[in-house]
Interface confidence: low
Amino acid sequence: GGSCGSEHYNMTSEFEEMLGGSGGSEDIYLEERKTIKVLGGSGGSVETDDQSPEKINILGGSCGS
């Protein structure tokens, strides 16, 4: 589990209809994902076995899963 710590997180509902998902990967789910902070969506993220996880991007509004 995890949480969204971005200062932008609470802004997303205002723009909910503008952008949807923006993530994705294969086989193993990544622990965090980038959230579209201004335009309102967020995307799934999963990693293949041979790829290292993307870093948590606090200012980008990353969320734990």
Epitope: G20, G21, G23, G24, I36, G41, G44, G60
Partner: antibody, heavy 113, light 112 residues
Framework: EVQLVQPGAELRNPGASVKVSCKAS????????IVWVRQAPGEGLEWMGR????????KYAQKFQGRVTFTADTSTNTAYVELSSLRSDDTAVYYC??????WGKGTLVTVSS | ATMLTQSPGSLSVVPGESASISCKAS???????????LYWLQQKPGQSPQRLIY???RRGSGVPDRFTGSGSGTDFTLNISDMKAEDAGVYYC?????????FGSGTSVEIK
């Protein structure tokens, strides 16, 4: 208004490289992945990969790995895809899209001698 | 890779009638965050794709409520009611729950 502006067309010889630009406006540039999708004439959509403009992090489709490079310039809100060692079957419309949500008009890349 | 199988490949619809397009995923599109990242895109002739629906059923601003997305897990449907001439084009489902992102093969909708 969200806009992704791309050049209309590029013509290249086989074996050459092409670099296609995508200038974004109307939203916070670093807030969405720029995704590259191509569409060969009369065919469906093919995902090439994506770049996170915030940190330059990339994911490439296996098919294009080693032949494609994504870059993003946050000073101009412009993303680029460069495809090298072009073949005739790379002839396609190349689209940039902000997280699949907003799409550019596409750039027709024609590979022909 | 996650495969998206769309059916039918083509449809011919009388104006005012309804149409339904199916998209079946090779694995569940439910992300570990509980969201399902399934889109429906519309591509009119000579134009770029445009997003109609995201996260299975959410319509973007400006998208008529004649377009309705539904489904869960691996089975998804786009319904178009009261078909209009301007609805002609190719419809794609797409997912970004997994890398690589993937697209259905498209459903061509013709207006009779």
């Amino acid at each position: 208004e969200v806009q992704l502006v791309q050049p209309g067309a590029e013509l290249r010889n086989p074996g050459a490289s092409v670099k296609v630009s995508c200038k974004a406006s109307g939203y916070t540039y670093t807030s969405a992945y720029i995704v590259w999708v191509r569409q060969a004439p009369g065919e469906g959509l093919e995902w090439m990969g994506r770049i996170d403009p915030e940190d330059g992090g990339t994911k490439y489709a296996q098919k294009f790995q080693g032949r494609v490079t994504f870059t993003a310039d946050t000073s101009t809100n412009t993303a680029y895809v460069e495809l090298s060692s072009l073949r005739s079957d790379d002839t396609a419309v190349y689209y940039c899209t902000a997280g699949l949500d907003y799409w550019g008009k596409g750039t027709l890349v024609t590979v022909s001698s | 890779a996650t495969m998206l199988t769309q059916s039918p490949g083509s449809l011919s619809v009388v104006p005012g009638e309804s149409a339904s397009i199916s998209c079946k995923a090779s694995q569940s599109l439910v992300h570990s965050d509980g969201m399902t990242y399934l889109y429906w895109l519309q591509q009119k002739p000579g134009q770029s794709p445009q997003r109609l629906i995201y996260r299975v059923s959410r319509r973007g601003s400006g998208v008529p409520d004649r377009f309705t997305g539904s489904g869960s897990g691996t089975d998804f449907t786009l319904n178009i009611s009261d078909m209009k001439a301007e609805d002609a084009g190719v419809y794609y489902c797409a997912q970004d729950t997994y890398y690589p992102y993937s697209f259905g093969s498209g459903t061509s909708v013709e207006i009779k």
